[in-house]
């Protein structure tokens, strides 16, 4: 014959534990029912009566089967730099994440405690590491033969256009200006790579090959003056 099913509350066999969705009440010394998510224990069990559960009040929740006397309070409303990606319900807490153009500078168990705007790289510098939900943008100087003329959290250094005849050589913050109506070749935007190790303009570190996708115009003409965003200021 099958074993008789015990109904809560019941005294567990010595050495055994209560079943799933039950808990052991130390006072009653009985296995009692837990309350379902979205509820809490209004009245704890006794030797003769089971747990009495009640729904969570507005702005409170329980996410798990529980026997807590009060539901947890939902987190405060999302700040202006955040968006609510999960609403506060009886069964789940509110989750706030950073809005586009921001990243989480200080996270909490779920969502974000403090958002910060993504760094914008100034002209002469490009995005070397894009921002993520939890990390800021990293900017790096544009390599010779590349430039960025924007202040942006997304723009990378782009290759200078290559001219038949150069009117104004490009630098780190400005594209080359051609005298002819159109350049002989301009690198496709899709071919651009993020900044990489390059030889220093001042030639004080070990030279390394320039990125193949960002050829310097220096094989056509001498390098132009120092770039605006990283130029020289001697007398």
């Amino acid at each position: 014959l099958p074993a008789q099913v015990a109904f809560t509350p019941y005294a567990p066999e010595p050495g055994s534990t209560c079943r799933l969705r039950e808990y052991y009440d130390q006072t009653a010394q009985m296995c009692c029912s837990k309350c379902s998510p979205g509820q809490h224990a209004k009245v704890f069990c006794t030797k003769t009566s089971d747990t009495v559960c009640d729904s969570c009040e507005d702005s409170t929740y329980t996410q798990l089967w529980n026997w807590v006397p009060e539901c947890l309070s939902c987190g405060s409303r999302c700040s202006s730099d955040q968006v609510e990606t999960q609403a506060c319900t009886r069964e789940q807490n509110r989750i706030c994440t950073c809005r586009p153009g921001w990243y989480c500078a200080l996270s909490k168990q779920e969502g974000c405690r403090l958002c910060a705007p993504l760094r914008k790289c100034r002209p002469g510098f490009g995005v070397a590491r894009p921002g993520t939900e939890t990390s800021d943008v990293v900017c790096k100087p544009c390599a010779p033969g590349t430039f960025s003329n924007t202040t942006s959290s997304t723009d990378i250094c782009r290759p200078h256009q290559i001219c038949n005849v150069v009117a104004i050589p490009g630098n780190a913050s400005m594209d080359a200006v051609c005298t002819s109506t159109s350049p002989t070749r301009s690198m496709a935007p899709g071919a651009v790579h993020l900044p990489q190790p390059v030889s220093t303009r001042s030639q004080h570190t070990q030279p390394t090959p320039e990125p193949s996708t960002a050829p310097s115009t220096s094989f056509l003409l001498p390098m132009g003056p120092s770039p605006p965003a990283e130029g020289s200021t001697g007398d």
Epitope: C121, R122, A128, A143, P195, V198, A229, G231, T233
Partner: antibody, heavy 119, light 106 residues
Framework: QVQLVQSGAEVKKPGASVKVSCKAS????????IHWVRQAPGQGLEWMGW????????DYADKFKKRVTMTADTSISTAFMELSRLRSDDTAVYYC????????????WGQGTLVTVSS | DIQMTQSPSSLSASVGDRVTITCQGS??????LAWFQQKPGKAPKLLIY???SLQTGVPSRFSGSRSGTDFTLTISSLQPEDFATYFC????????FGGGTKLELK
């Protein structure tokens, strides 16, 4: 918190070289460039150059191009500035400052290193 | 190279005064101008960057403005701790500091 701690004061003879260090802490060293700025006694601030510690790329002011070398050791989060062929008018306080290449520039500085050039 | 002409080179004022310091660029530098405060024996401290933006922790009595290539630092009501030397700094084309303005107690 962000800190840039520089090496101690130096006294050098004309013609010698000096190497000043700048140890960074409290942030990711390779995510910022390091500028070097100097200030002669009673004078204004003078930009010398910067180094990107990540790749070792540098950019120097024309005035210092032939005499300055900026390096960095990422393993110890330290930037170095070496100035050679010292003259008496190189007597100054030398500062390092970090820069994230955004519009927010030089938001943290070292305490400065006094270099005295005297025979 | 872009030159930054800062004026006046020195200035006497009293606590509570409104003070303005100007910097003129020899050519266009967009908004890439910062202001630093320096006290004797100390490193410079960033006050304002990108012409108008107040650095975190800097009192709101400091403000920056621009008219063409003329840039202004204004201290709305001088406090005793504001007596120091102020430098402008352009970082659009190369890097160049202004000559400095020493703000002294009248």
């Amino acid at each position: 918190q962000v800190q840039l701690v520089q090496s101690g004061a130096e006294v050098k003879k004309p013609g010698a070289s000096v190497k000043v260090s700048c140890k960074a802490s409290g942030y990711t060293f390779t995510d910022y460039i390091i500028h070097w700025v100097r200030q002669a006694p009673g004078q204004g601030l003078e930009w010398m150059g910067w180094i990107d510690p990540d790749y070792g790329n540098t950019d120097y002011a024309d005035k210092f191009k032939k005499r300055v070398t900026m390096t960095a050791d990422t393993s110890i989060s330290t930037a170095f500035m070496e100035l050679s062929r010292l003259r008496s008018d190189d007597t100054a306080v030398y500062y390092c400052a970090r820069d994230d290449a955004s519009p927010l520039v030089m938001d943290a500085w070292g305490q400065g290193t006094l270099v005295t050039v005297s025979s | 190279d872009i030159q930054m002409t800062q004026s006046p080179s020195s200035l006497s004022a009293s606590v509570g005064d409104r003070v303005t310091i100007t910097c003129q660029g020899s050519q266009n530098i967009d908004n890439y101008l910062a202001w630093f405060q320096q006290k004797p024996g100390k490193a410079p401290k960033l006050l304002i960057y990108s012409t108008y933006s107040l650095q975190t922790g800097v009192p709101s009595r400091f403000s920056g403005s621009r008219s063409g290539t003329d840039f202004t630092l204004t201290i709305s009501s001088l406090q005793p701790e504001d007596f120091a030397t102020y430098f402008c700094f352009q970082y659009n084309q190369g890097y160049m500091f202004g000559g400095g303005t020493k703000l002294e107690l009248k």
